[in-house]
């Protein structure tokens, strides 16, 4: 008897590999036998010349060769893309609609994201080596290459994690050259060779020499600071420089900063910062108003240096980035004692000339302004009847002065004589801080 | 269309965890490899993590590596990222962007909000 | 890490009239293959950024005609050739040469 027609077998999705065609299977019942009808991205497909579809006996749908692809940039589509297939089957009592089967062709980019590097490894120790394969479709596998064959690896001593390969305990044999394979159904690429050197291990409690490098530091920039750090950002520099010497460089290189003393001076200590770069590098925290003195220290594993020369850079003073610290308002006999702490150090930015003292001015004090030179940090103003005196004070730099303390004021109730006289347990006068 | 919906966001402690989802549609989930961005309020965007399409590979920098985890479904066709031991200076919204091979973001998400304060 | 810088970091425009942005990295963003990928962004008030450029000088699509990209080597220009009301917002450029992937510090423009 008559029935509509029922999908038995969809299509499924496929990598189109070349050189013989694809093929998309879809089977159906239904009586009387259902038609086969195939689209392409929900279009019918036309199978006339030069279309490269064509249609089997059995519904069966052969791609001949792969259509015009998407662009990487239309929102649906990579370019790996080819689109997806369904197949319909109609009789006079209805049409089947099978699942969508996508296909696509296989694609393996050139661009490593991440090249293994040449580096220096101690006996005993682990080391990895890092691989980051190009893009593909299918996503490629990573294999390793020492020396120009496949790498033997070693349960319990190589291990590859996410392209990674990760040695355990480094042996001399492991000495070489290595290089990272992506390999998928498109092919493979093959990364840089990165030349592995292994050191014995050494007993000394001083880190070994690396003698045989030569470093030369030859540039300390002052960096722009960046806006997003905000109105005050600390400084930075640049530093960069040249590494000659053996075959496998060093593993990481250590700035070494200090602040330059008077000359005969005993020369600070020595602060040392791991950099992330291999010829140049980002070096933050570092002090406005400051001169310094830069090198850099190269190592791999327990072996270091030798040092660099030595490069000056005087960073430019800036205003005070805090405000001096408690702020106080006493009163004294026909005066008010202003005194205050200096900013904490690392806000200094520079060296501290003096300070700026404002009164806001109202009914008892006008608006004026002092200056203390120096390292003073008080100040005694006259007063001459009762009322709210308030102040605020800033630190000055040779770039002018700081971020103002939030105000102090103090209320004088009544006249000064008859408070010397009449002292009550709190005083006569309150001091609050706005 | 091309969608992306994050979620998962909201205010922890110093020190502790979250789990961010991306929610995608609109497109082969499964053939695009994605990434996490961060922008800090009135700061630059910052690059935090990608995955490859299988979600064999990923990738970090150095301020998140080892504490961050992305990581991707695609039967759920759904991204994540696994944030533990957060700081303070990783308050940010946090975005997920589609990538087109390893060459560029194409599409964003509305991004969710991260605010790691005590 | 590649720092990228970009200048100006605010620029005031006016409608109608030419604009351009510059990008400088500290190292060289072509790789070993002679491939460079350095795209631009444009991240309105309130919004998440929009692809603008891609390697270097490609438009995405949807993105007008009057925006382009240029440069080799380290250093890049977004030009927008007739500033529209729209086009404001801060601008970023993205590095994905090297890892870790590096955004500008941004340049905001805004109209006169």
């Known amino acids: 008897q008559d029935s509509p027609p029922q999908i038995l077998v969809h299509p499924q999705d496929q990598l189109f590999q070349g050189p013989g065609p694809a093929r998309m299977s879809c089977q159906a019942s239904g009586q009387p036998p259902p038609t086969i009808r195939w689209l392409l991205n929900g279009q019918p497909l036309s199978m006339v010349p030069p279309d490269p579809h064509h249609l089997l006996p059995d519904g069966t749908l052969l791609l001949l060769q792969p259509p015009a692809r998407g662009h990487a940039h239309d929102g649906q589509a990579l370019s790996t893309d080819l689109g997806v297939y369904t197949c319909e089957a109609s009789n006079r009592l209805g049409t089947a609609v099978s699942r969508g089967a996508r296909l696509s062709v296989a694609v393996l980019r050139e661009d490593f994201q991440i090249q293994p590097r040449d580096m220096v490894a101690v006996v005993g120790e682990q080391f990895t080596l890092e691989c980051g394969p190009p893009w593909g479709h299918p996503e490629p596998t990573v294999s390793w290459w020492k020396d120009g064959k496949p790498l033997a690896l070693q349960p319990g001593r190589h291990t590859v994690s996410g392209g990674s390969l990760l040695m355990a305990r480094a042996e001399k044999s492991d000495e070489g050259t290595y290089m990272c394979v992506a390999t998928n159904s498109a092919g493979h690429r093959e990364s840089r060779a990165a030349r592995v050197s292994i050191q014995e291990p050494q007993d000394y409690t001083e880190p070994v020499e690396l003698l045989a490098v030569r470093i030369q530091l030859e540039n300390v920039t002052l960096l722009n600071p960046d806006p997003a750090e905000g109105p005050k950002p600390r400084p930075a520099v640049w530093l960069s420089w040249k590494v000659s010497g053996p075959a496998a460089p060093a593993q990481s290189y250590t700035a070494l900063f200090r602040t330059q003393t008077a000359p005969g001076g005993q020369g600070a200590p020595w602060a040392e910062e791991l950099l992330a770069g291999w010829q140049s590098a980002e070096l933050g925290g570092l002090h406005w108003g400051q001169d310094y003195e830069f090198k850099v220290r190269p190592s791999s594993g327990r072996a270091r240096g030798p040092d660099s020369n030595v490069l000056l850079l005087r960073l430019p003073e800036k205003v005070p980035s805090a405000p001096p610290q408690e702020v106080t308002l006493k009163p004294g006999n026909g005066t008010v004692f202003v005194s205050w702490v200096p900013p904490p150090a690392e806000n200094h930015n520079g060296i501290i000339r003096g300070y700026q003292v404002w009164s806001l001015g109202n009914t008892s004090l006008p608006p004026a302004n002092w200056t203390v030179v120096g390292e003073q940090t008080q100040l005694e103003i006259a007063t001459h009847m009762p009322g709210s005196y308030c102040v605020q004070v800033a630190a000055v730099t040779g770039a002018g002065a700081g971020e103002p303390s939030r105000p102090v004021c103090l209320l004088l109730e009544q006249a000064m004589e008859r408070a010397t006289q009449e002292p009550s347990e709190h005083g006569p006068w309150t001091l609050e801080q706005l | 269309e091309v969608q992306l919906v994050e979620s998962g966001g909201g205010l922890v402690q110093p020190g502790g965890s979250l789990r961010l989802s991306c929610a995608a549609s609109?497109?082969?989930?499964?053939?695009?490899?994605m990434s996490w961005v961060r922008q800090a309020p009135g700061k630059r965007l910052e690059w935090v993590a990608t995955i490859s399409q299988g979600g064999t590979y990923t990738y970090y920098p150095d301020s998140v590596k080892g504490r961050f985890t992305i990581s991707r479904d695609n039967a759920k066709n759904t991204l994540y990222l696994q944030m533990n031991s957060l700081r303070a200076e990783d308050t940010a919204v946090y975005y997920c962007?589609?990538?087109?091979?390893?060459?560029?973001?194409?599409?964003w998400g509305q991004g969710t909000l991260v605010t790691v304060s005590s | 890490d590649i720092v990228m810088t970009q200048s100006p970091l605010s620029l005031p425009v006016t409608l109608g009239e030419p604009a351009s942005i510059s990008c400088r990295s500290s190292?060289?963003?072509?790789?070993?293959?002679?491939?460079?990928?350095l795209n631009w962004y444009l991240q309105k008030p309130g919004q998440s950024p929009q692809l603008l450029i891609y390697?270097?000088?490609n438009r995405f699509s949807g993105v007008p005609d009057r925006f382009s990209g240029s440069g080799s080597g380290t250093d890049f220009t977004l030009k927008i050739s007739r500033v529209e009301a729209e086009d404001v917002g801060v601008y970023y450029c993205l590095q994905v040469t090297h890892v870790p992937w590096t955004f500008g510090p941004g340049t905001k423009v805004d109209i006169k």
């Open positions: 962007a589609r990538l087109i091979y390893y060459d560029y973001l194409d599409y």
């Open positions: 190292q060289s963003l072509e790789n070993s293959n002679g491939n460079t990928y």
């Open positions: 390697r270097v000088s």
């Open positions: 609109g497109f082969t989930f499964s053939t695009y490899a």
